[in-house]
Interface confidence: low
């Protein structure tokens, strides 16, 4: 997705994005909360297509690992947190049943706040 | 994805999530920047599977439409901005070629900052 830094902007939370293959991923959590195996390849009309995903998560080495950038620290505690979304993937469940399911993958790094008590 | 409010937390930016069908979406932008048509259904053995996507974007009606929550306003200007990620979808390009392509979809609402100049 477009890079805020290019527009002279900073993100409140630093993130890293990467392409993750099913081979790297191995398992995921589906919408029912069950753990499923992510199949490496998807059969298509002309053979097989490697299954992979674009994932974004909070940068554990970034400046914002201790808290979010630009927050009013007098009033708020902050934390950068990886959030997830759902994408469809070809998977196999614990009963070895194969099918397309929506699985959770990391898609963003957002800032969450809690009010500072008793100042 | 898990709801920060459940943990007594607030998001720096308010977002809304929804399931979007290909019929609603109609077109999308692929990784090369080209506009493609998103096919409504994917052929499967017993008919067709509806193609749909889980999308998250900034809430235009939310409190944070004027700027991010919890920001140190003495030093920063802020804006909540919808970010995108890539998911695979069955699409048709301008030359009517059908295939699986990665398309951009809205997946998050994050806060971007710019430093306040000349105080």
């Amino acid at each position: 997705h477009s890079d805020p830094a290019r527009r002279g902007e900073l993100s409140v939370c630093d993130s890293i994005s990467e392409w993750v293959t099913a081979a790297d991923k191995k398992t995921a959590v589906d919408m029912s909360g069950g753990t499923v195996t992510v199949l490496e390849k998807v059969p298509v009309s002309k053979g097989q297509l490697k299954q992979y995903f674009y994932e974004t998560k909070c940068n554990p080495m970034g400046y914002t690992k201790e808290g979010c950038r630009g927050i009013d620290k007098r009033h708020w505690n902050s934390q950068c947190r990886t959030t997830q979304s759902y994408v469809r993937a070809l998977t196999m469940d614990s009963k070895k049943r194969i099918g397309w399911r929506f699985i959770r993958i990391d898609t963003s790094c957002v800032c969450t706040l809690t009010i500072k008590r008793g100042r | 994805h898990s709801d920060p409010a459940r943990r007594g937390e607030l998001s720096v930016c308010d977002s809304i999530s929804e399931w979007v069908t290909a019929a609603d979406k109609k077109t999308a932008v692929d990784m090369s920047g080209g506009t493609v048509t998103v096919l409504e259904k994917v052929p499967v053995s017993k008919g067709q599977l509806k193609q749909y996507f889980y999308e998250t974007k900034c809430n235009p009606m939310g409190y944070t439409k004027e700027g991010c929550r919890g920001i140190d306003k003495r030093h920063w200007n802020s804006q909540c901005r919808t970010t995108q990620s890539y998911v695979r979808a069955l699409t048709m390009d301008s030359k009517k070629r059908i295939g699986w392509r990665f398309i951009r979809i809205d997946t998050s609402c994050v806060c971007t900052l710019t430093i306040k100049r000349g105080r």
Partner: antibody, heavy 122, light 109 residues
Framework: EVQLLESGGGLVQSGGSLRLSCAAS????????MTWVRQAPGKGLEWVST???????YYADSVMGRFTISRDNSKNTLYLQMNGLRAEDTAVYYC????????????????WGQGTTVTVSS | KIVLTQSPGTLSLSPGERATLSCRAS???????LAWYQQKPGQAPRLLIY???RRATGIPARFSGSGSGTDFTLTISSLEPEDFAVYYC??????????FGGGTKVEIK
């Protein structure tokens, strides 16, 4: 056109073995889960075993440990190796397609073969 | 294991009449994970309805399926001579095992 042709049935003594085959054509065999269903004389349908596209296998309790389902994708053929046969295994055995990887993993049996008869004498 | 109970065991009707066959599950199988098959003597079963209400390819419109949860129905709006057969329901919600009902025989009155 989808075609499934079972073979290998016959008369066998109790405790004996048989290997059933199901030759498939008219569809991409590799993409499909396949199932064996049997029907005892004058009785209803009973699920026996299923093998999925990744060769994950499932068995009815009544045949677990005695029957083995397998597939040879290069030959488009499904097998059922039946050992330790009992009189109650006497039935017509059908093979059937059970859905492709493009489906959610809950699927009925779309296409059936005509069946092969297994008779176990005691 | 989900048990499917079909009723009635036998249905005696005349051509042109409406046939209503019932299939009850011992526990909920969702809104769609039920199939109906037709079997004629000496023949293999044939898929009629899947996902509770969707007609399989080539199945005439007089066959329809309905229901969800534990109660499902196969309706033949106007019986044709070739419809006299045994009908089985099957659940594919919670498997293994895949389970079938005991069957309903539709015979000529």
């Amino acid at each position: 056109e989808v075609q499934l042709l079972e073979s290998g049935g016959g008369l066998v003594q109790s405790g004996g073995s048989l290997r059933l085959s199901c030759a498939a054509s008219g569809f991409i065999f590799d993409d499909y889960a396949m199932t064996w269903v049997r029907q005892a004389p004058g009785k209803g349908l009973e699920w026996v075993s299923t093998i999925n596209q990744n060769s994950g296998t499932y068995y009815a309790d009544s045949v677990m440990g005695r029957f083995t389902i397998s597939r040879d994708n290069s030959k488009n053929t499904l097998y059922l190796q039946m050992n330790g046969l009992r009189a109650e295994d006497t039935a017509v055995y059908y093979c059937a397609t059970t859905g492709t990887t493009y489906d959610y993993p809950h699927y009925p049996m779309d296409f059936w073969g005509q069946g092969t008869t297994v008779t176990v004498s005691s | 294991k989900i048990v499917l109970t079909q009723s009635p065991g036998t249905l005696s009707l005349s051509p042109g009449e409406r046939a209503t066959l019932s299939c009850r599950a011992s526990q909920s199988i969702g809104s769609r994970y039920l199939a109906w098959y037709q079997q004629k003597p000496g023949q293999a079963p044939r898929l009629l309805i899947y996902d509770a209400s969707r007609r399989a390819t080539g199945i005439p419109a007089r066959f329809s399926g309905s229901g969800s949860g534990t109660d499902f129905t196969l309706t033949i709006s106007s019986l044709e001579p070739e419809d006299f057969a045994v009908y089985y329901c099957q659940q594919y919600y919670d498997w293994p095992p895949l389970t079938f009902g005991g069957g309903t025989k539709v015979e000529i009155k």
